[in-house]
C-alpha cells in the first residue's frame, strides 16, 4: 500500500474574543526538501461528533515537519457548546499522482469552553462582542441549574431563542442596530433567586469608505495623498482604524500615520505613472479606493518667490518673480492680479519657465496697490499655488484739477472783504498730499501788479482785504511734485448784492429742488450757494458749480435738518469770472410746528371789545412757515360769536377759535363781547404742520356800560 | 453571599499617590464589568472608572484620565485604583461596583480618601 | 456630557402616599437610564435599570419610566422604609453620569 500522507499532531486552541477555533498540524513523512501541494479536508462538529455543522478543503504547499495552521470563526460563541474537531489529508499534486488518495481522519480533538466556566448559576455569551450595524449575532446563556426558567432581554425586550441542550439556549438577532456609543444591553435572569447576569453588544455604525481621496506633489519629489475618512464609528474605544497606501508599480505599500493625509516619496527612477490603493481598516473591516495618474499631470506648484515690484512710477510699475523649478522642460502659467482699493482692477496671464515679470500699466498715481501672483502647470492644469503678495504706492504726480473755489464778499469800511473758501482735492486729483495752496491776486485795473498768497495744507479758505477795484484771483493746489491747473474766479469793484426777491420753496426727502430762469447773456456757469448750519456764526458754507445749460439742480446733504431754514442764492458766472446773483429762494427740508407763541398785548379795552397786538417775530427762528395766527377765546356764553367757531382743547375745555390767515397781520380787534363780562384768550402761530404750543390763556373782563360815567 | 470589600483609605497629601483595592467573592469576578464611582459627602454620585472582564478595555471620567489607572487581577478576584498626583478635590468616599452592563448592581460598602495637608 | 437634572432637592410624603421622582436628561439618552436608592450610611442599590425594568428584589411599589430625556421613579404607597436618597443614572453616552439626587423625607 503506497505510503500515505496524514496529517499529524494536531493541536486546536480558542481564542474565545474573536470565536476562533485555531487549528495547527504538521505532515511527518515528507522526504527531506519535498514540497508538495496537498488539502486537508477539516470536519467540525457541535455537541456530539455525529452533528457536523462545517466542512472544508484547505488546499496550501507542505514541507516536512512544517506547521501548518488554519482558523474558523465560529457564529455561536464557543462558550455556549462542545466542538469537535478532526482532518485527513491527500497529495494533489502532479509530481505525484499514485498519492491521490485521502488519508485516514485523526482523532476527534474535542473543545469544550463550558467546563473552564466559574459556578455561577448563570453566564451569557459572548462577552464584548463587536460588530457592525446590520450584522447577525448569536447570543447564548449557559445555565447550571435545571429547574430555573431563565429569560433574556434585548434593550428591555424579552428575546425568544431555541435550546441548544437542557442547560443552553441560543438566541439570532439579526440586523442589529446601531443604539449608542455604550453599546447595545442584553440581560438574563432567573425567574426564582436573584440571578441576573448582563452583557453589552457594541454595534458600531458602518466603517465608510475613504472619500475623496487625490494626490498631488509639490516639487516631484514627495506626493502627499488626502482623504476625508469616513464618518465616526459611534464607538468610543473600540474601533480604531489603520490606513495603508500601496503603489502596484513599484510594489510599495507605507503605513500611514495620519487618519486624512499620507506622504509618499517620489521614485528616483523617473516613475511617471502611479497606481495607488488606499486601504482603510479596523477590526470589522476593509474599505478600499483606488487612484491612477501620471505625475506630471497632479503638480500643484509652490507658491512664487522673490517677488519684487520695481521701477514704481506714478503710472507704471514692474512686478518680477522667480517659481519653483517642476522639471526640466515645464512651463508654468502664472497669474497677476492687480488690487486697488480691495477689488480687482487688473488680470493677467503669463507663461514662465523660471523667471517671470509683468508691467503694469495705467495705474493712478500717489495709490497703494497689492499686486498678487500664483503660477500652476502650463501644460496639465491640475492646482494654482497659492498667492504671493506685495504691496506698493504709486509716485506722485502734479495734481490734476483745479481747486473748487468759491467766495464772500463784504463791504467794510470802504473796502472789500473777499472771504475764499476751497474744497480739497479729492484723492484722484490731489495725486499725492497736497503741501500749500497759492492765491494770486490779479489786480485788473492794473494788469502788471500781481500779489502771491502762499497758504499751507490743509487750510480750506482765506480772508482777503482788497480795495474798491477789480481783481481776478487764480487759487492752485500744490504737492511735492507740481501745481495744479489754475481755478480762476473774478471779483469787482461792486459787491453785487443787489436786491432780489425770496422765493420759497418745499423741500423733500430728496432734498431742495431749485430751478432759475437762464440767462440771456453769456453765461460760463452757475454757482447754488446755502449755509449747512443757518445762524451759526461759522455757517459751514457750501456751493455746487453747474454748468451754463443747467436751470434745475436738487441739493442734498445729511446735514439738513427738519425745522431749520435753508437759504439759497443762485449766482450766474460771467465770461469775466465774475459771479452776480440772480435768484434766492428759502424753505425747509422738513417743517415743524411753532416752537413758541408770540407776546400779546391787549388794548382799547371798552364794553364790547378789545384790540390784540403782537410783535413781529425773526421768522428765519421759527421751523417752519408762518402762515396765520389762531386766537382762542373762551367764555361763558354758549354760542361762538361771529367770525369764530367752536375749537376743542386738549384738555378737553370748549372754547372759541378765529383764523387769522395773513401771516402779517399783528393786530386783532375782539368785538361783540358782552358789558361785564369775563373772557380768556390765548393766540398761537401755525405753519403748514400744525399750531404752536398750547400756552396760558390770559384773562379779562370788559366793563359795565356805565363804569366810565 | 455576593460581596465587595474596598481596602482601608485614608489621609494622604496633596501630590501623593495611593492605591485602592477591592477584593470580590461570591461570584465569578471574571464574569462582570467592574467599577469605581465616589461620593463627597452630603453631594451626589460621580463616576470615576469603568473595565471590561478581562482587563483589556477601560473607559474613565475624562479629567481624571491622566492620574487614576483602573485594572483587575482575575486570579485573585481583586479590582484596583491607582490614583496620583492626588488633589483636595479627590477627598470622597470611593466605592467598588460590579457592573450588569453599565449600571451597577452591587456595590461595596465604601472607603474613605481625605487629601489634605 | 450629559448632564442628568433631578429637580426636587427633597421630597416630603406621607406613608401611604405616592410619590413620582423625576429625572431630565440635557439630551436623548433613549432608556439607558438606571434609578439607585441609599439609605443614610449605606451605599447605593440598584432599583431599576433600563429606565423600567425592576431589579431582582425590588418591592414592585417601585416602578420606573419614560424615555429620551425625561425620566420617572414612582413609589406608590410609601414605606418608612423607603426614606433614603434616590438617585438616576444615565449610559448611555460616556461619560457615565448621575443626578445630584432626591431625598425622601417622611411628612
Known amino acids: 500500500e503506497p505510503l500515505s500522507l496524514a496529517p499529524e499532531s494536531l493541536e486546536v486552541s480558542i481564542d474565545s474574543a474573536r470565536q476562533c477555533l485555531h487549528l495547527k498540524w504538521s505532515v511527518h513523512n515528507l522526504a527531506y526538501h519535498q514540497e508538495l501541494k496537498m488539502v486537508f479536508q477539516i470536519e467540525i462538529s457541535r455537541i456530539k461528533t455525529s452533528n457536523v455543522i462545517w466542512v472544508e478543503n484547505y488546499s496550501t504547499t507542505v514541507k516536512r515537519n512544517q506547521v501548518l495552521r488554519w482558523s474558523w470563526e465560529s457564529k455561536l460563541p464557543l462558550e455556549c457548546a462542545k466542538h469537535s474537531v478532526r482532518m485527513r489529508g491527500a497529495v494533489d499534486d502532479a509530481q505525484v499522482p499514485e498519492l491521490r488518495f485521502w488519508s485516514n481522519w485523526t482523532s476527534w480533538e474535542e473543545v469544550d469552553v463550558q467546563s473552564s466556566l466559574g459556578h455561577d448559576p448563570l453566564f451569557v455569551f459572548p462577552k464584548d462582542k463587536l460588530v457592525e450595524e446590520g450584522s447577525n449575532v448569536t447570543i447564548c446563556y449557559v445555565s447550571r441549574s435545571h429547574q430555573n426558567n431563565i429569560s433574556c432581554y434585548l434593550e428591555g425586550v424579552r428575546m425568544h431563542g431555541e435550546q441548544l441542550d437542557p442547560n443552553v439556549c441560543v438566541f439570532h438577532l439579526k440586523n442589529v442596530p446601531f443604539i449608542r456609543e455604550t453599546g447595545t444591553n442584553i440581560y438574563c435572569k432567573a425567574d426564582q433567586g436573584d440571578v441576573i447576569k448582563g452583557i453589552v453588544l457594541f454595534v458600531s455604525k458602518v466603517f465608510e469608505e475613504p472619500k475623496d481621496f487625490s494626490c498631488e506633489t509639490r516639487d516631484l519629489k514627495t506626493l502627499n495623498c488626502t482623504w476625508a475618512p469616513g464618518s465616526d464609528a459611534g464607538l468610543l474605544t473600540q474601533l480604531s482604524q489603520s490606513y495603508t497606501l500601496f503603489e502596484s508599480f513599484s510594489g510599495k505599500k507605507t503605513l500611514c500615520k495620519y487618519k486624512s493625509w499620507c506622504n509618499w516619496q517620489v521614485s528616483p527612477d523617473s516613475q511617471e505613472m502611479y497606481n495607488f490603493t488606499l486601504t482603510a481598516e479596523n477590526y470589522l473591516r476593509k474599505r478600499s479606493v483606488h487612484l491612477l495618474f501620471n505625475l506630471t499631470h497632479r503638480v500643484h506648484p509652490m507658491a512664487p518667490f522673490n517677488v519684487f515690484v520695481k521701477n514704481v512710477s506714478a503710472t507704471n510699475a514692474t512686478m518680477t518673480w522667480k517659481v519653483h523649478s517642476i522639471g526640466n522642460y515645464s512651463t508654468l502659467l502664472c497669474q497677476i492680479e492687480l488690487y486697488g482699493e480691495g477689488k480687482v482692477i487688473q488680470k493677467q496671464n503669463v507663461s514662465v519657465k523660471v523667471n517671470g515679470k509683468h508691467l503694469m500699466k495705467k495705474l493712478e498715481p500717489s495709490t497703494e496697490y497689492a499686486a498678487q501672483v500664483r503660477c500652476a502647470n502650463a501644460n496639465h492644469f491640475w492646482k494654482w499655488s497659492e498667492w504671493t503678495r506685495r504691496n506698493f504706492t504709486t509716485a506722485e504726480a502734479a495734481p490734476s484739477e483745479a481747486p473748487d473755489v468759491w467766495r464772500n464778499v463784504k463791504s467794510v469800511q470802504g473796502h472789500c472783504v473777499v472771504t475764499l473758501f476751497w474744497k480739497p482735492l479729492s484723492k484722484l486729483q490731489a495725486n499725492g498730499k497736497i503741501l500749500f495752496y497759492n492765491v494770486v491776486l490779479e489786480n485788473l485795473d492794473r494788469p502788471s501788479t500781481l500779489k502771491l498768497l502762499s497758504i499751507p495744507a490743509p487750510a480750506n479758505g482765506t480772508e482777503l482785504t482788497l480795495d474798491r477795484c477789480s481783481y481776478q484771483i487764480h487759487v492752485t493746489a500744490n504737492n511735492s511734485v507740481g501745481t495744479s491747473p489754475a481755478s480762476v474766479i473774478a471779483v469787482s469793484g461792486d459787491p453785487g448784492n443787489k436786491e432780489v426777491e425770496e422765493e420759497r420753496v418745499k423741500g423733500t426727502e430728496d432734498g431742495f429742488c431749485l430751478s432759475w430762469k437762464p440767462q440771456p447773456g453769456d453765461v460760463t456757469g452757475y454757482v447754488v450757494e446755502w449755509c449747512e448750519r443757518p445762524g451759526d456764526p461759522l455757517c459751514d458754507l457750501q456751493w455746487k458749480n453747474l454748468g451754463p445749460n443747467t436751470t434745475s439742480t436738487v441739493v442734498s446733504s445729511d446735514a439738513f435738518r427738519p425745522g431749520v431754514r435753508y437759504n439759497f442764492r443762485i449766482y450766474g458766472i460771467s465770461t469775466e469770472r465774475i459771479p452776480y446773483l440772480l435768484e434766492k429762494k428759502t424753505g425747509y427740508s422738513q417743517e415743524l410746528v411753532p416752537s413758541d407763541n408770540p407776546q400779546v398785548l391787549m388794548s382799547n379795552l371798552t364794553s364790547y371789545s378789545f384790540t390784540l397786538s403782537w410783535k413781529d417775530y425773526a421768522a428765519e427762528s421759527q421751523p417752519g412757515f408762518v402762515q396765520g395766527y389762531s386766537l382762542y377765546l373762551k367764555s361763558k356764553a354758549a354760542r361762538c360769536l361771529p367770525g369764530s367757531e367752536k375749537a376743542v382743547l386738549s384738555d378737553d375745555s370748549i372754547c372759541c377759535k378765529y383764523k387769522i390767515d395773513n401771516p402779517k397781520q399783528k393786530t386783532f380787534v375782539v368785538e361783540n363781547l358782552q358789558p361785564a363780562s369775563f373772557y380768556e384768550f390765548f393766540l398761537t402761530p401755525y405753519t403748514s404742520v400744525g399750531e404752536g404750543p398750547q400756552g396760558a390763556f390770559t384773562k379779562v373782563t370788559t366793563p359795565d356800560e356805565y363804569s366810565h360815567i | 453571599e455576593v460581596k465587595l470589600v474596598e481596602s482601608e483609605g485614608g489621609l494622604v497629601q496633596p501630590g501623593s499617590s495611593m492605591k485602592l483595592s477591592c477584593t470580590a467573592s461570591?461570584?465569578?469576578?471574571?464574569?462582570?464589568?467592574m467599577a469605581w464611582v465616589r461620593q463627597v459627602p452630603e453631594k451626589g454620585l460621580e463616576w470615576v472608572a469603568n473595565i471590561n472582564y478581562d482587563g483589556s478595555s477601560t473607559y474613565y471620567l475624562d479629567s481624571l484620565k491622566s492620574r487614576f489607572i483602573i485594572s483587575r487581577d482575575n486570579a485573585k478576584n481583586i479590582l484596583y485604583l491607582q490614583m496620583s498626583s492626588l488633589k483636595s478635590e479627590d477627598t470622597a468616599t470611593y466605592y467598588c461596583a460590579r457592573g450588569l452592563t453599565w449600571d451597577f448592581d452591587v456595590w461595596g460598602t465604601g472607603t474613605t480618601v481625605t487629601v489634605s495637608s | 456630557d450629559i448632564v442628568m437634572t433631578q429637580s426636587h432637592k427633597f421630597m416630603s410624603p406621607s406613608v401611604g402616599d405616592r410619590v413620582s421622582i423625576t429625572c431630565k436628561a440635557s439630551q436623548d439618552v433613549d432608556t439607558a437610564v438606571a434609578w439607585y436608592q441609599q439609605k443614610p450610611g449605606q451605599s447605593p442599590k440598584l432599583l431599576i435599570y433600563?429606565?423600567?425594568t425592576r431589579h431582582t428584589g425590588v418591592p414592585d411599589r417601585f416602578t420606573g419610566s419614560g424615555s429620551g430625556t425625561d425620566f420617572t421613579l414612582t413609589i406608590s404607597n410609601v414605606q418608612s422604609e423607603d426614606l433614603a436618597d434616590y438617585f438616576c443614572?444615565?449610559?448611555?453616552?460616556?461619560?457615565?453620569?448621575f443626578g445630584a439626587g432626591t431625598k425622601l423625607e417622611l411628612k
Open positions: 461570591g461570584f465569578t469576578f471574571s464574569d462582570y464589568y
Open positions: 443614572q444615565q449610559y448611555s453616552r460616556f461619560p457615565l453620569t
Open positions: 433600563l429606565a423600567s
